[in-house]
Interface confidence: low
Amino acid sequence: MVKQIESKTAFQEALDAAGDKLVVVDFSATWCGPCKMIKPFFHSLSEKYSNVIFLEVDVDDCQDVASECEVKCMPTFQFFKKGQKVGEFSGANKEKLEATINELV
């Protein structure tokens, strides 16, 4: 399951609540073609990796979170553990997304 993040507080709360678990954040936008393309894959990964927390941030609805996380382009994937960013990349690269999850989980 992918959790939609609606505010900065909700974002920080989700990171905090994750404990030791890996958190994967998808920063996307409704007008972004590559974001739409990778979205089903991102959701399928959330089913496959049940021990990982998957979050989705719409950069237009949540500009403060996107700004705080210094998101410059979409899609951007950021990875957090224990509240710390442990990885990041931009682009709709399915292989890299799953490889990074496997590397960090």
Epitope: S7, T9, Q12, E13, K82, G83, Q84, K85
Partner: antibody
Framework: EVQLQQSGAELVKPGASVKLSCTAS????????MHWVKQRPEQGLEWIGR????????KYDPKFQGKATITADTSSNTAYLQLSSLTSEDTAVYYC??????????WGQGTSVTVS | QIVLTQSPAIMSASPGEKVTMTCSAS?????MYWYQQKPGTSPKRWIY???KLASGVPARFSGSGSGTSYSLTISTMEAEDAATYYC????????FGAGTKLELK
Amino acid sequence: EVQLQQSGAELVKPGASVKLSCTASGFNIKDTFMHWVKQRPEQGLEWIGRIDPANGNTKYDPKFQGKATITADTSSNTAYLQLSSLTSEDTAVYYCALLQYSAMDYWGQGTSVTVS
Amino acid sequence: QIVLTQSPAIMSASPGEKVTMTCSASSRISYMYWYQQKPGTSPKRWIYDTSKLASGVPARFSGSGSGTSYSLTISTMEAEDAATYYCHQRSSYPTFGAGTKLELK
């Protein structure tokens, strides 16, 4: 412009309590976490804890559990730090801080507490 | 809790000299933060995400490291760099190092 304005210096007696305030401007404290940091004279920085003002959830360094109580009032956009059963070890400057992940951090000017 | 050990505790450098200070973590961390503090002032974020310079920080500063070993380097010391530098990690329970006091020789 983001600013954190802290209350003035305190001189308190051993065994007493003190409540420090930190009023934010330029942002809504409900949208973030507010942290408190202690710095004893000529010493380093110690993280005390933080609050999520949106729901009142707090987290403390175990060392400060029972000593410090962090609260917030969203109507006045203010976070508070209460210190109880004060001793000379509590003589320090206390900072409120907005510690963000990658964006700029913001710190208050500090409040000096002297226990004497 | 992660303990951060900074060395040296105090050091002095002449203008133009290269300066390196280190911060060792008791457990692996993913990113290190560094703060600069001058007497009577609040700490200032100096370096974040291990190697990114905060806004307004001169390019002579750099940060590096991974795992448990991190460092802050000044390529050519200037008088205004004299200050105390603290390393900081952002796990579930944030901690700071004891600081390195950099004096002008």
